[in-house]
Interface confidence: low
């Protein structure tokens, strides 16, 4: 089930070619696999990567360019994702999600 994530909608505007950082706040005890999704208007949500909080490692979905996204941060409090070399097609709503059980 979906679990332990603090929702906080935030708008970020960046120029093409620049970077952006998104924060996912985790409730205490939120561990396991934390997923990042991109939802663009008219499309189904697309998983970009997931973060294994047990080993602090990142697994990219196939087709995602290494270096495009970087996820890091606390495995107990929050998780950040950096988006690099932004293009117009990166526009959309980014979500983090986790499951337990």
């Amino acid at each position: 089930k979906s679990s332990n994530l603090e929702g906080r909608t935030k708008s970020v505007i960046r120029q093409t070619g620049s970077s952006a950082e998104i924060t996912c706040d985790l409730a205490e005890g939120s561990t396991g696999y934390i997923h990042w999704y991109l939802h663009q208007e008219g499309k189904a949500p697309q998983r970009l990567l997931y973060y294994d909080s047990y080993t602090s490692s990142v697994v990219l979905e196939s087709g995602i360019s290494p270096g495009k996204y970087d996820t890091y941060g606390s495995t107990r409090k929050n998780l950040r994702m950096i988006l690099r070399n932004l293009i117009e097609n990166d526009s959309g709503v980014y979500y983090c999600a986790t499951w337990d059980g």
């Epitope: 561990t31 909080s53 047990y54 080993t55 602090s56 490692s57 990142v58 697994v59 990219l60 290494p66 970087d70 996820t71 890091y72 606390s74 495995t75 107990r76 409090k77 929050n78």
Partner: antibody
């Protein structure tokens, strides 16, 4: 098997320089962040420096910042630590250490699963 | 920069349980990882992350975290568990180690 072999230690006078090397084998060297950790005689472990898998990010303990430089040569599977302006308090065994998780890890992550045997650096006049 | 504080020494009777702690502000946000160093040997990763052990490390080693404290518990301590135990975690500038705890099995 995974192996890290340090070299380059020795006796140096205060103010002098040394370059430590660490030859890595048994794993894909350029997929892993690496660290240098030191241990003064009879003392605990002290992290010295880390470098990202690609070598683009480096970081240093405050005690060595500006004096030590970490680098890596992927073609030679070798990690380096250039130590300048050495002080008596730099005397220690220096360990080359592999990060536990691969490319996705940023250089400052701290799970360290393979340690070399260490090389002794003595700074004394 | 952060500091991690460990008790200098603890002792435990053979087969009994011992817990060693690691305290520091960085542990409010990041898990510790734990290393054992026996005399004359290099450190060995014992536990990392939430509660993960590398292959070859027995399940009598476990960890927990609360607030600014990380704990390593050895349940049913064996003679071979003797050694110096170090915690480490993230630091504002990289990585920080605790000062180490000497564990003696009686």
């Amino acid at each position: 098997q995974v192996q890290l072999v340090e070299s380059g230690g020795g006796l140096v006078q205060p103010g002098g320089s040394l370059r430590l090397s660490c030859a890595a084998s048994g794993f894909t060297f350029d997929d892993y962040a690496m660290h240098w950790v030191r241990q003064a005689p009879g003392k605990g472990l002290e992290w010295v420096s880390g470098i990202s898998a690609g070598g683009g990010s480096t970081n240093y303990a405050g005690s060595v910042k500006g004096r030590f430089t970490v680098s890596r040569d992927t073609s030679k599977n070798t990690l380096y630590l250039q130590m300048n302006s050495l002080r008596a308090e730099d005397t220690a065994v220096y360990y080359c250490v592999k990060s536990y998780v691969d490319t996705a890890m940023r250089y400052y992550y701290y799970y360290m699963d393979v340690w070399g045997q260490g090389t002794m650096v003595t700074v004394s006049s | 920069s952060y500091e991690l504080t460990q008790d200098p020494a603890v002792s435990v009777a053979l087969g009994q349980t011992v817990t060693i702690t690691c305290q520091g502000d960085s542990l409010r946000n990041y898990y510790a990882s734990w290393y054992r160093q026996k005399p004359g040997q290099t450190p060995v990763l014992v536990v990392y992350g939430k509660n993960n052990r590398p292959s070859g490390i027995p399940d009598r080693f476990s960890v927990s975290a609360s607030g600014n404290t990380a704990s390593l518990t050895i349940t049913g301590a064996q003679a071979e568990d003797e050694g110096d135990y170090y915690c480490n975690s993230r630091d504002s500038s990289g990585v920080v180690f605790g000062g180490g705890t000497k564990v003696t099995v009686l």
